[in-house]
Amino acid sequence: WELTILHTNDVHSRLEQTSEDSSKCVNASRCMGGVARLFTKVQQIRRAEPNVLLLDAGDQYQGTIWFTVYKGAEVAHFMNALRYDAMALGNHEFDNGVEGLIEPLLKEAKFPILSANIKAKGPLASQISGLYLPYKVLPVGDEVVGIVGYTSKETPFLSNPGTNLVFEDEITALQPEVDKLKTLNVNKIIALGHSGFETDKLIAQKVRGVDVVVGGHSNTFLYTGNPPSKEVPAGKYPFIVTSDDGRKVPVVQAYAFGKYLGYLKIEFDERGNVISSHGNPILLNSSIPEDPSIKADINKWRIKLDNYSTQELGKTIVYLDGSSQSCRFRECNMGNLICDAMINNNLRHADEMFWNHVSMCILNGGGIRSPIDERNNGTITWENLAAVLPFGGTFDLVQLKGSTLKKAFEHSVHRYGQSTGEFLQVGGIHVVYDLSRKPGDRVVKLDVLCTKCRVPSYDPLKMDEIYKVILPNFLANGGDGFQMIKDELLRHDSGDQDINVVSTYISKMKVIYPAVEGRIK
């Protein structure tokens, strides 16, 4: 018996088609993704093949002006229109708090929303009961398939789930749910979730009875053969893991931003064992037409966004590199621009002794979510910035000891090379890393721009001195593992909305051309 699994993950509000790098679509003939195009492909496969499931592995929320304006209502509406069969909760589904998940999505979705490792407590338990499930048994033809969900246990550090949701270890939480499905005579089980590729592989290895793992969170691109676009595969599709009980378990993920539709064909034997698996992500490029009816609906919803977002704020004459491939690995000019804007926004309280009260900025590379292409007439709009900074955060002022900053920079590269979000972009700081040294001892030089000076210059960081730093509220609250900031900050003043800070700076500068200039080495 053959099952076709179609899957998406980390779509991040890309309801409309995008450019190849998942930023705003400029040249429609070269654009990709979007729900109208996705629907065309899904319907084509549903018509051609008998047993099809359409699954989403989380993080539909957050990423463009669509989410800024519609706050999740757009996710429910268009996922319903595409007739998704199930979705797992991602960390970003909690960005607007639990209420921002319950009202627009959980109450409106016509498909099951799953997570086995999130447990509600206190007053929330009764309010959220039944709105998301640990698993769901779906009829497919005359067979049944069990879907168990999971969500990154790091979600409390990555988003705003509040204090009444407990995020358990994925493997510990999944096993009893899979066992329950087995007792219900469900012998074909898919784990669908949002914890990243490494955890996906562990689930495949450790959770007895899971036949297939469909993941997200790490934006992992897997492909067998010659890849069709710019993404470099992290492995073959599907990625095969040998479980502890000797089975081969296919693990898949479909990059991000709705650019690809994951396509996995699984053949099961009479006992529910996977006897073969093959497929590849399908690049949703312009060779696939956008479905006219979904496109018309998009255009109708789009009207509300236009007023909000389309005025030109200023121009760039250079490519603003906000790609994760750059900003999570090295100095990127988008990071430099944002940090410069953050410092500029705090130009105040100068006197004879201090040219400014603050000169330093740090910004987690993972918070930069999109590049901006200068080839659109150089125009920068609010909408462009909302794709770069989609989280609706604030840029805050904190006071920290030098020793805390040193710890933060060590944390920045403690697991360098895994495309994790904690790699810091900077302003008013020069940092030199030696990655050949062991984690926790990689910062070999850390110089900071003086404030108590008439001519700003870089001096070595002093461990016992207290410094002011501008940073995202996400970091001030210990996000991306920066617990030392949360635990050791001496003062925290909340600041202005992140997009507004950058848009104000661009409007002020009129034309920008940020460079990569050796802040990070």
Epitope: W1, D142, E143, D269, E270, R271, N273, I275, S276
Partner: antibody, heavy 112, light 107 residues
Framework: QVQLQQSGPELVKPGASVKISCKAS????????IHWVKQRPGQGLEWIGW????????KYSEKFKDKATLTADTSSSTAYMQLSSLTSEDSAVYFC?????WGQGTTLTVSS | DIQMTQSPSSLSASLGERVSLTCRAS??????LIWLQQEPAGTFKRLIY???SLDSGVPKRFSGSRSGSDYSLTISSLESEDFVDYYC?????????FGGGTKLEIK
């Protein structure tokens, strides 16, 4: 659990026909192929053909296309193989098989 | 049709010994290979499916692997009940084809 239960041994005369049954349980009969395999002592295993019970579609090995007829009754989840114009060469053990499990085998003896 | 060449046709080994049986496919079959055990009573039991996945209830001393077009069944430490017949079967395309079998005998 998955089981394929075959009919008992057959002793038939040359030239006659025989119909062997294979009753499936523990899974959805119409969704999986049933294959038939012949084993003669010292001659290994030979694939005869398959039937897909959901549609009734069949495929035969060239060698057996005039010898075997495969059918299925979905109401009883039973597959059948009829062998015709029997000769001593047809004396063998016949197995029905899915991808996961095999029937216990039916011994056919063709003798006058 | 795809030919499956199984070797050796018979093998004499001792209790506790490690043995490997091999099947070579004449055409690409990917990972669509099964190893079957036939007991003296004639009943067949699947040990390995999809080249290297171990069937539930099958002892972990059995393992399957692939190198190019060569497929192997390895028994890491022979036990008395392992001295029976073994067949490989490709299910990549019809007709199914089998290896000629290996008779494993106790030394």
């Amino acid at each position: 659990q998955v089981q394929l239960q075959q009919s008992g041994p057959e002793l038939v005369k040359p030239g006659a026909s025989v119909k062997i049954s294979c009753k499936a349980s523990g899974y959805i009969f119409t969704n999986y192929y049933i294959h038939w395999v012949k084993q003669r002592p010292g001659q290994g295993l030979e694939w005869i053909g398959w039937i897909f019970p959901g549609s009734g579609n069949t495929k035969y090995s060239e060698k057996f296309k005039d010898k075997a007829t495969l059918t299925a009754d979905t109401s009883s989840s039973t597959a059948y193989m009829q062998l015709s114009s029997l000769t001593s060469e047809d004396s063998a053990v016949y197995f029905c098989a899915g991808l996961s499990d095999w029937g216990q085998g039916t011994t056919l003896t063709v003798s006058s | 049709d795809i030919q499956m060449t199984q070797s050796p046709s018979s093998l004499s080994a001792s209790l506790g010994e490690r043995v490997s049986l091999t099947c070579r496919a004449s055409q690409d079959i990917g990972d669509r290979l099964i190893w079957l055990q036939q007991e003296p009573a004639g009943t067949f039991k699947r040990l390995i499916y999809a080249t290297s996945s171990l069937d539930s209830g099958v002892p972990k001393r059995f393992s399957g692997s692939r190198s190019g077009s060569d497929y192997s069944l390895t028994i890491s430490s022979l036990e008395s009940e392992d001295f029976v017949d073994y067949y490989c079967l490709q299910y990549a395309s019809s007709p199914w084809t089998f290896g000629g079998g290996t008779k494993l005998e106790i030394k």
